[in-house]
Interface confidence: low
Amino acid sequence: RDKVMSEFNNNFRQQMENYPKNNHTASILDRMQADFKCCGAANYTDWEKIPSMSKNRVPDSCCINVTVGCGINFNEKAIHKEGCVEKIGGWLRKNVLEQKLISEEDLGGEQKLISEEDLHHHHHH
C-alpha cells in the first residue's frame, strides 16, 4: 500500500505539472481538489513550484468558496490548505484499498489519477 501511495503521489505531482497545459488533466485535478477539499499534493504551496503558475496563484478549485479567479492573489484563509495526496490517500485506504484491494494500476495512468468509478463513490458531507 505504501508503494501504491508513493505511485499516487508521483502521479498527482506529474499531473500538477500538466495542469496549465492540459484542460483534461486540469478538469480531473479541479474535480478532486474541490470534492476532497484539498489543494496541491502535500499542501497548497506545491502550486508555487509549477512553471507558468504564478507564485500568488492556485487553481480556483482550491478555494473554499469557488468563484472564477478566486485562486489569483489568494488569501490563505480562503483556500483549502491540506494536501490532496494525504487526504485522498486516507480515503482510498479506508474506502477502496481495504474493501476492494484494487490493483495498483487503478491508481495510476496518464489521465486518471484514481479510477472514475472509485471517485464517484466518494460522498463528502
Epitope: H24, A26, S27, R31, H120
Partner: antibody, heavy 119, light 108 residues
Framework: QVQLEESGGGVVKAGGSLRLSCAAS????????INWIRQAPGKGLEWVSY????????YYADSVKGRFTMSRDNAKNSVYLQMNGLRAEDTAFYYC????????????WGQGTLVTVSS | DIQMTQSPSSLSASVGDRVTITCRAS??????LHWYQQKPGKAPKLLIY???SLQSGVPSRFSGSGSGTDFTLTISTLQPEDFATYYC??????????FGQGTRLEIK
Amino acid sequence: QVQLEESGGGVVKAGGSLRLSCAASGFTFSDYYINWIRQAPGKGLEWVSYINNGGYTIYYADSVKGRFTMSRDNAKNSVYLQMNGLRAEDTAFYYCVRDPRSYYGFDYWGQGTLVTVSS
Amino acid sequence: DIQMTQSPSSLSASVGDRVTITCRASQSISRFLHWYQQKPGKAPKLLIYGASSLQSGVPSRFSGSGSGTDFTLTISTLQPEDFATYYCQQSYSTPPITFGQGTRLEIK
C-alpha cells in the same frame, strides 16, 4: 465580447449529411473546450459532443457515436460538426457552447442553428 | 450515466413570489451542478455554477444551494422577466454531460 456563431443548418433527407460550423471570437479560443448541445423543438437540452482545447480528446453522446464527427481549427477559431446518416430524431437546434472547465458550467452559447431531417 | 431529475416539471407563480426548483442527481456530484435559464427562441443562459456561485451579470435574486445529490435554485422575488424554462446540468462525471428535463415557470 465573447461570441459564438453557428452556421450550416438546414433541411436534409434522412440518411443525408450536413456540416455545422461554429465561429468564435472575443476570447483566446485555444484555451477552451467547445461543446455541441442540441434541443429538439419543444424538448429539453441534450449534450452531443465536446472537444478539448487541443483537439485531441473528443467525446460523443451514444445517440450520435459513429455518425457525427467533431473537429476544430484553432488557427481559424472554429469548430465543426460533420453529421452523417442523419435521422428524424436528429432534428433540433444545435448550439455551440464554450466550456471553461468542469466547475464553471457553460458560460457562453451561440444562437443556435436548426437542423431538420425529413423522412 | 448520472441522471438528473428536476421537480416540479412546471409551476405557476406570480410576480413577487419566492420560487424554488429542485434538482436531484442519481449519485453524488459534489458541487458540479449548474443552472440555466432559457426563454422561448433563445439560447440558454448560465445563472449559477458550482451549485451556488452567481454568474457575472445575473441578478442577486437568483441563488443556488446544495451538495452531493440534492440541489435547489431559488428566485427570491419573482420578476416578470423570470418566466422561462430552467435546467440543471451536472459536469462531475463526463462524458456524458447530463441535463435535467427542465422546469417551466409560468405566470399564474
